[in-house]
Amino acid sequence: LPGVGLTPSAAQTARQHPKMHLAHSTLKPAAHLIGDPSKQNSLLWRANTDRAFLQDGFSLSNNSLLVPTSGIYFVYSQVVFSGKAYSPKATSSPLYLAHEVQLFSSQYPFHVPLLSSQKMVYPGLQEPWLHSMYHGAAFQLTQGDQLSTHTDGIPHLVLSPSTVFFGAFAL
Amino acid sequence: LPGVGLTPSAAQTARQHPKMHLAHSTLKPAAHLIGDPSKQNSLLWRANTDRAFLQDGFSLSNNSLLVPTSGIYFVYSQVVFSGKAYSPKATSSPLYLAHEVQLFSSQYPFHVPLLSSQKMVYPGLQEPWLHSMYHGAAFQLTQGDQLSTHTDGIPHLVLSPSTVFFGAFAL
Amino acid sequence: LPGVGLTPSAAQTARQHPKMHLAHSTLKPAAHLIGDPSKQNSLLWRANTDRAFLQDGFSLSNNSLLVPTSGIYFVYSQVVFSGKAYSPKATSSPLYLAHEVQLFSSQYPFHVPLLSSQKMVYPGLQEPWLHSMYHGAAFQLTQGDQLSTHTDGIPHLVLSPSTVFFGAFAL
């Protein structure tokens, strides 16, 4: 049935997607999360709004994606940062911007970086700036693994559904 | 049969790719478009050249990709921009570069941004510049949805098959 | 058996991967390579360490990925570059950074660029810099085709498993 195995919000979407699960008899876990634009100084992932969804077993726990079944997944994320020119009275210090997708697994007592992108920005006078970072790759993951992100430069995020997102799908 | 459901050019390719559809008994819609290098001040997508293709129901209409069947798709695009140094006599104005993949659906009376990347460039004296933008993500799409792009900075595009492209595939 | 086909560290993970090959009765070729951090002035791809892997027929040949069977593949790669400020005594010359995924097939007497990203960097005084490049797309490939990379700016690569990688998977 359409919507079966989906979160409430994704199920709602899927009622309009009658053919969504017909292409494969097997389940195809997939998730696409967007940064919550109402939280300006943090990056909280949401799946119950706009075009975000959790499908076929993906779930969200403590701002992390929980891997529903062992296998190979393509994992991806994007952030866009922006900033204004610095004031002539202030000193311009370089800004370190970074975004990382991390894996937390019962095997390891720490977060393992899977995907990392970095940038140094040097704000100038009268010079607003914008910078985008994207990355994605295939990883062997285990049921129960936690995928999370770490970002340096959160106050500079341009939080919109099309600029800041995080997702994964089973291959 | 090889070539079934392909555009003429892709069908031609697929006749020599007899195994292309054997890995899955179900259809796997996929498309990869490249920017037409002969059109310097616009971004026209082409599927009948180089390594571009439309497979298993994808089609191109009004410079948009038409979604062949409802389901989850990974959608991606890249652009590369370049520019020369500004002349000492000219004033250097900042350049806003942006690239967006948009969804037009009968559900909404407007184009919904799915993927957006942005950059401000400040051309300097004797300083040619280059900038690349890439993004991709998974979306729930409906049969007949239109995927298109919008780009700020089109005159600065480096139009080649490996630098400017737009594609999607069903998961 | 769980753990079969993984690197030693990943094998440990895969003992908890009993379902890894059950999701599809058909084979799903996939590969994820990382840049060898012990080779500082070259970019050598490795699949037998960290989270890198070769699955279901992918193989390496002369630092290239060999396509295991004809079909459509999503191919991706990322690099991160970094540099220090130039010394006041030295002249600052612009740095051309580029990363390209190439296809070698004897059909052509040359490597065909599939994915290209480029950047010009102008190192400044007291200004360390960082730059990330990512790209990926879907291509129709033939059994035995060779996928390789070419990079300008290799001495500036930040070689770690999460920053420099190259991969592909069958759709």
Partner: antibody
Framework: EVQLVESGGGLVQPGGSLRLSCAAS????????IHWVRQAPGKGLEWVGY????????NYNEKFKGRFTISSDKSKNTAYLQMNSLRAEDTAVYYC???????????WGQGTLVTVSS | DIQMTQSPSSLSASVGDRVTITCRAS??????VAWYQQKPGKAPKLLIY???HRYTGVPSRFSGSGSGTDFTLTISSLQPEDFATYYC?????????FGQGTKVEIK
């Protein structure tokens, strides 16, 4: 049913040349590469290289580069192994093989014996 | 080139015995190992690919395991038709190399 039939083997003098053929049937010839693998008498197996009939792509074991050339003729559904400057140590049974996935030798011909001797 | 070292080079066993053949790679090869069976005067036959996957039509008594550098082919209950020479092959990187073979003989 996939069938591979080698021919062209025989006795050749050191320094001489020989061309082996592999006639393929039972599948679409351009869909898969053809590998050549050899086995010296009483010894193990050694991969020589492959050719893709679809695009004439080749990949060789470096050991054989320069002396051996692998090619194919789509119109005849046949692959070839051209061997030049043959040495005594090239004496072996030469097999052609068709893979499923590229590095797995799933279908084999019956082999053809090449003897290099004066 | 990657070296594949098989052990033992030969073994004697009886019908119904459990037989284990090992193969060690000179460097880690992920799961990229296949196993073949060859009978005198015949071409080899593919048994196992990707270290543990049985090829189509191969009886379930044949199984493969291992990852990294150490791999095993097991015949759970030896049958008369299993007396042959067995080869491992790495498919991690070219030139793809084979082990020297293990001859399984009747005791």
């Amino acid at each position: 049913e996939v069938q591979l039939v080698e021919s062209g083997g025989g006795l050749v003098q050191p320094g001489g040349s020989l061309r082996l053929s592999c006639a393929a049937s039972g599948y679409t010839f351009t869909s898969y590469v053809i590998h050549w693998v050899r086995q010296a008498p009483g010894k193990g197996l050694e991969w020589v290289g492959y050719n893709n009939p679809y695009n004439d792509g080749t990949n060789y074991n470096e050991k054989f580069k320069g002396r051996f050339t692998i090619s194919s003729d789509k119109s005849k559904n046949t692959a070839y192994l051209q061997m030049n400057s043959l040495r005594a140590e090239d004496t072996a049974v030469y097999y052609c093989s068709r893979p499923t996935m590229l590095p797995w030798f799933a279908y084999w011909g019956q082999g053809t014996l090449v003897t290099v001797s004066s | 080139d990657i070296q594949m070292t098989q052990s033992p080079s030969s073994l004697s066993a009886s019908v119904g015995d459990r037989v284990t053949i090992t193969c060690r790679a000179s460097q880690a090869v992920s799961s990229a190992v296949a196993w073949y069976q060859q009978k005198p005067g015949k071409a080899p036959k593919l048994l196992i690919y990707s270290a543990s996957h049985r090829y189509t039509g191969v009886p379930s008594r044949f199984s493969g395991s291992g990852s990294g550098t150490d791999f095993t082919l097991t015949i759970s209950s030896l049958q008369p038709e299993d007396f042959a020479t067995y080869y491992c092959q790495e498919s991690y990187s070219t030139p793809w190399t084979f082990g020297q073979g293990t001859k399984v003989e009747i005791k």
